[in-house]
Interface confidence: medium
């Protein structure tokens, strides 16, 4: 989109960025607003109701002034002009300040994460080298699902100290591969907490926990709820004994009956002796009948 180069009409040269400019035609804005003036007074643009097409002209002026990408002093004050930027524009930026990131996320607040925002976040995080606690705090405040949008490789750059910023709802959409990466970090982050406090913090990460950690939790009277149990890795649940599951769930063990057709409960039941299941008094069916020999095929494969 090119605006014809025309001379600025007499008396219309902009001395400052102010409300009078909303009455300028697009060609007048192009001709009468100095790009350097615009760059130094970017904070005013947000307070002036420029139209969609007028904003195109202002962006064009900034693009001409900064062909290599805008400086952070301009980026921080872009306001809703940010919505005009393409991912290609944003890739030219070097955003280092968390305040700048917050200012731009604020503009997009309440909307889905746009390609522009995704690019901005990517540039910011790569510039910092890791996803530190303050950044994670900010990102999850604006986008609760942000953490689960990262690949396991990207999550590996999250330092354990950042895990303190994670809220349970931030993990709602994480898949097992992501939790596999996050769980060891959470375990490390919360290691100095006592039993009940530790469980409250680690609970939402348990979808990445191995069998031995679940066995250890079963010794601590944690009373895990069924929703958490259903998110555990099937391979981590299968080796647990009936007694261990009973201790792990505490009073919530009764909920197993309602979930007996769903994984991981279904698969776990198939691995237990029916005698042992009967001790729960829940009427769980599908266990190994009495007198049958249980072969641990996984152990056999490992030996051969």
């Amino acid at each position: 989109r090119e605006v014809e180069k025309t001379a600025c009409p007499s008396g219309k040269k902009a001395r400052e960025i102010d409300e009078s400019l909303i009455f300028y035609k697009k060609w007048e804005l192009e001709a009468c607003v100095d790009a350097a003036l615009l760059a130094t007074q970017m904070d005013r643009v947000n307070a002036i109701p420029f139209t969609y097409e007028q904003l195109d002209v202002l962006k064009h002026k900034l693009d001409e002034l900064y062909p290599q990408g805008y400086p952070e002093s301009v980026i921080q004050h872009l306001g809703y002009l940010f919505l005009k930027m393409s991912p290609e524009d944003i890739r030219k930026w070097n955003v280092t300040s968390l305040e700048t990131l917050k200012a731009l996320l604020e503009v997009n607040k309440g909307h889905e994460m746009s390609p522009q925002v995704a690019t901005l976040i990517d540039r910011f995080v790569k510039g910092r080298g890791q996803l530190d606690k303050d950044t994670l705090d900010t990102l999850t405040a604006f986008y609760p699902g942000y953490l689960c949008s990262l690949s396991p490789e990207e999550l590996s750059s999250v330092p354990p100290s950042s895990i303190w910023a994670v809220r349970p709802q931030d993990l709602d959409t994480c898949d097992p591969r992501q939790l596999d990466v996050l769980y060891p970090k959470a375990r490390l982050a919360f290691q100095n907490m006592n039993g009940s406090e530790y469980f409250v913090k680690i609970q939402s990460f348990l979808g990445g926990a191995p069998t031995e950690d679940l066995k250890a939790l079963s010794q601590q009277n944690v009373s895990m709820d069924l929703a958490t149990f259903m998110k555990l890795r099937t391979d981590a649940v299968l080796p647990l004994t009936v007694a261990e599951v009973q201790k792990l769930l505490g009073p919530h063990v009764e909920g197993l009956k309602a979930e007996e057709r769903h994984r991981p409960v279904r698969d776990w039941i198939l691995r237990q002796r029916q005698d042992d299941l009967d001790t729960l008094g829940l009427g769980l069916q599908g266990g190994i009948p009495n007198g049958y020999l249980v072969l641990d095929l996984s152990m056999q494969e490992a030996l051969s």
């Epitope: 009455f23 109701p49 097409e53 503009v107």
Partner: nanobody
Framework: DVQLVDSGGGLVQAGGSLRLSCAAS????????MAWFRQAPGKEREIVAV????????YYAESVKGRFTISGDNPKNTVYLQMNSLKPEDTAVYYC????????????WGQGTQVTVSS
């Protein structure tokens, strides 16, 4: 295209209040700026207030600053003009308007609603 339907005008005593509404329809309403203009008998049409949907920024003519408030309800695609402390000189036909370009080109207009302020 954008269609605008304005309403809420009427007869009011000086010092009274009115609220005008403008319902906008069309595929890309959110990319338009909305405004209220007015035209008194024998006078030119003048801009009263402007709002930018996206940024929420506003503009007011000097004559109405502090008395009139323009606001938008994005989900409803409706713009309001709350008019307080009305004066006889506010008497005019008020028009809702929308543009993506500038207020001097490519502007869509509502049908107008009469506001009469009696002394």
């Amino acid at each position: 295209d954008v269609q605008l339907v304005d309403s809420g005008g009427g007869l009011v005593q000086a010092g009274g209040s009115l609220r005008l509404s403008c319902a906008a329809s069309g595929r890309t309403v959110s990319t338009y700026n909305m405004a209220w203009f007015r035209q008194a008998p024998g006078k030119e049409r003048e801009i009263v207030a402007v709002i930018n949907w996206t940024g929420g920024s506003t503009y007011y003519a000097e004559s109405v600053k502090g008395r009139f408030t323009i606001s938008g309800d994005n989900p409803k695609n409706t713009v309001y003009l709350q008019m307080n402390s009305l004066k006889p000189e506010d008497t005019a036909v008020y028009y809702c308007a929308a543009t993506r370009a500038s207020w001097t080109e490519n502007t869509y207009w509502g049908q107008g609603t009469q506001v009469t302020v009696s002394s």
